[in-house]
């Protein structure tokens, strides 16, 4: 199809090649175009649109994404070249920050329903660099966290530095919707819940005497709760004890739980005490079995091919571990009786 | 910095613009809006035109007011004064957030037959 | 519509005593959005407090905001001849629309 019709946004992604960071775009069709599609009312309704109205389907999903190849190529289907671009409703996700993500993206709807919706299209260029250090030293991280029922801000990592005096107005999304009140560099949030959460974009244009782009930023966003103050409790083994059948295998599951920690470096680890000796043991990785907000359940399991004679005389101990301390809890073996 | 013009007397029903002229920032990168205080009274938040070019409007507004920009110039567009819209009009950098950072001196509309 | 109620009005204080404004919001304001201006005699507003208790640039630490949801307060303590001026709470609202100032609050150094 001809895109010389579609309305053109530029935009920039400048990443910061010390964390990973995703990015999005939006398909912004031209109002009222975008509120029967993807039910997401992003501008003013005061504003005039640009285009005929767009005799669109509801359906959220409607929307096709192309790249245009910079050498001239046909467009091509994003979700038949572009693994690492992933698409969802009306947004376009890219999962991995790159140079090679630069270029010309389009969307439009996939039902073309009356001859005017042919030119309802979008084309978004998209610039990506790599941050340069001189910049800010204390700029926001892509990924931030508020803490539950306490006050925090969000800060648009492009932004974080300016003050808020001299900060551009700022478009914020959350989720995809435009949150209109807030045009600053940072929002503030009076009292964290949970609902808080979510994947944040940020946009502010700059503009020099030829043209002018919108600069965007993704900000993942977690609320959690305050760091624990208590070491890790084992769940399991509760008894010292275990009655077991001589040659036959045994497996004896280690389960603790741990508080959550914002730098999170959860030790649990087995090792056997046979009289003055001691020695860690080799066994399977340990597994996540329950994750809250407030504790993580964790699992470790030593794993015996056949009880013998000696194993009766050794005591299997359970060592856990978190930056607060260690607990452990050892188990001795016991020949079943009859 | 922001300075207003185009105040002065106006009879009633005449339209009437005033203008917003910036410099040292782009029009283009910020929010701006008007404000508006009768003679001994409060103040009046109008109107925010954003970066990109939509407006929001108070309530109590109902049609009266438009607010527009060009590359350095905002304007505000009374369409048919009445003698309450007698006041000093201000222009601010800031938004529908509240927060006006930066305030022109203002320029006084008088409407009287 | 949106209501926000200063008190009280006028209010006058001594060179280095304390004073509180408040400003009461009807509905809650949106999130802290919550501005407090000062303006004095032929000249425009001037930014204090920013979203309820954040100081703008420039303006002495003896003015503090506190507050949130429909109840706000503006305390200058240490009070100085220069802070002789009419205050001013602003609250955004959700869908804007609604956005308003508080009728203001003299306030007279003695």
């Known amino acids: 199809f001809n895109i010389s019709g579609c309305s053109t946004k530029k935009l920039l992604w400048t990443y910061s090649t010390r964390s990973e960071e995703e990015f999005v775009l939006f398909c912004d069709l031209p109002e009222p175009q975008k509120s029967h599609f993807c039910h997401r009312n992003r501008l003013s309704p005061k504003q005039v649109p640009e285009h005929l109205p767009f005799m669109g389907s509801n359906d959220l999903s409607d929307v096709q994404w192309y790249q245009q190849p910079s050498n001239g190529d046909p467009l091509e289907d994003i979700r038949k070249s572009y693994p690492h671009i992933i698409q969802d409703k009306c947004t376009l996700h890219f999962l991995t920050p790159g140079v090679n993500n630069s270029g010309s993206y389009i969307c439009r709807p996939k039902m073309i329903k009356s001859p005017y919706d042919v030119a309802c299209c979008v084309k978004m260029i998209l610039e990506v660099k790599p941050q340069t250090n001189a910049s800010c030293e204390y700029s926001a991280s892509h990924k931030q966290d508020l803490l539950l029922g306490s006050t925090g801000s969000i800060s648009c990592p492009s932004l974080s530095c300016q003050s808020d005096a001299q900060s551009p107005a700022v478009t914020w999304y959350k989720n995809g919707k435009l949150l209109s009140v807030e045009r600053s560099n940072r929002i503030v949030v009076d009292e964290v819940y949970d609902y808080h959460q979510g994947t944040y974009v940020c946009d502010y244009t700059q503009s020099d005497t030829v043209s002018s782009w919108t600069v965007r930023a993704v900000v993942q966003v977690r609320t959690i709760v305050g760091d624990t103050k208590l070491k890790p409790d084992i769940l399991d083994p509760v008894e010292d004890t275990l009655e077991v059948e001589l040659g036959k295998p045994l497996t004896i599951s280690c389960k603790a739980r741990f508080g959550f920690e914002r730098v999170f470096n959860p030790v649990i680890k087995w090792y056997i005490k046979d009289s003055d000796l001691e020695w860690e043991v080799s066994v399977p990785e340990a597994k996540s079995i329950k994750s809250t907000l407030k504790d993580e359940i964790i699992e470790r399991n030593i794993i015996l091919e056949k009880v013998t004679q000696r194993d009766l005389r050794r005591k299997f101990v359970c060592f856990v571990q978190n930056s607060i301390g260690n607990t452990t809890q050892s188990v001795q073996l016991k020949e079943k009786r009859g | 910095s922001l300075k207003e013009s185009g105040g002065g007397l106006v009879t009633p029903g005449t339209p009437l613009t005033l203008t917003c002229k910036v410099s040292?920032?782009?029009?283009?990168?910020?929010?701006m809006s008007w404000v508006r205080q009768a003679p001994g009274k409060g103040l009046e938040w109008i109107g925010t035109i954003y970066d990109g070019g939509s407006t929001y409007y108070a309530s109590w507004t109902k049609g009266r007011f438009t607010i527009s920009k060009a590359s350095t110039t905002v304007d505000l567009k009374i369409t048919s004064p009445t003698t309450e819209d007698t006041a000093t009009y201000f222009c601010?950098?800031?938004?529908?957030?509240?927060?006006?950072?930066?305030w022109g001196p203002g320029t006084l509309v008088s409407v009287s037959s | 519509a949106a209501v926000l109620t200063q008190t009280p009005s006028p209010v006058s204080a001594p060179v280095g005593g304390t004073v509180s404004i408040s400003c009461q919001s009807s509905p809650s304001v949106y999130s802290v959005y919550l501005s407090w201006y000062q303006q004095k005699p032929g000249q425009p507003p001037k930014l204090l407090i920013y979203?309820?208790?954040t100081l703008a640039s420039g303006v002495p630490s003896r003015f503090k905001g506190s507050g949130s949801g429909t109840q706000f307060t503006l305390t200058i303590s240490d009070v100085q001849c220069d802070d002789a001026a009419t205050y001013y709470c602003a609250g955004a609202y959700v869908g804007s629309s609604d956005n308003t100032f508080g009728g203001g609050t003299e306030m007279v150094v003695k």
């Open positions: 979203r309820a208790s």
């Open positions: 040292g920032f782009s029009l283009s990168s910020y929010d």
């Open positions: 601010a950098r800031g938004s529908t957030n509240m927060e006006f950072w930066f």
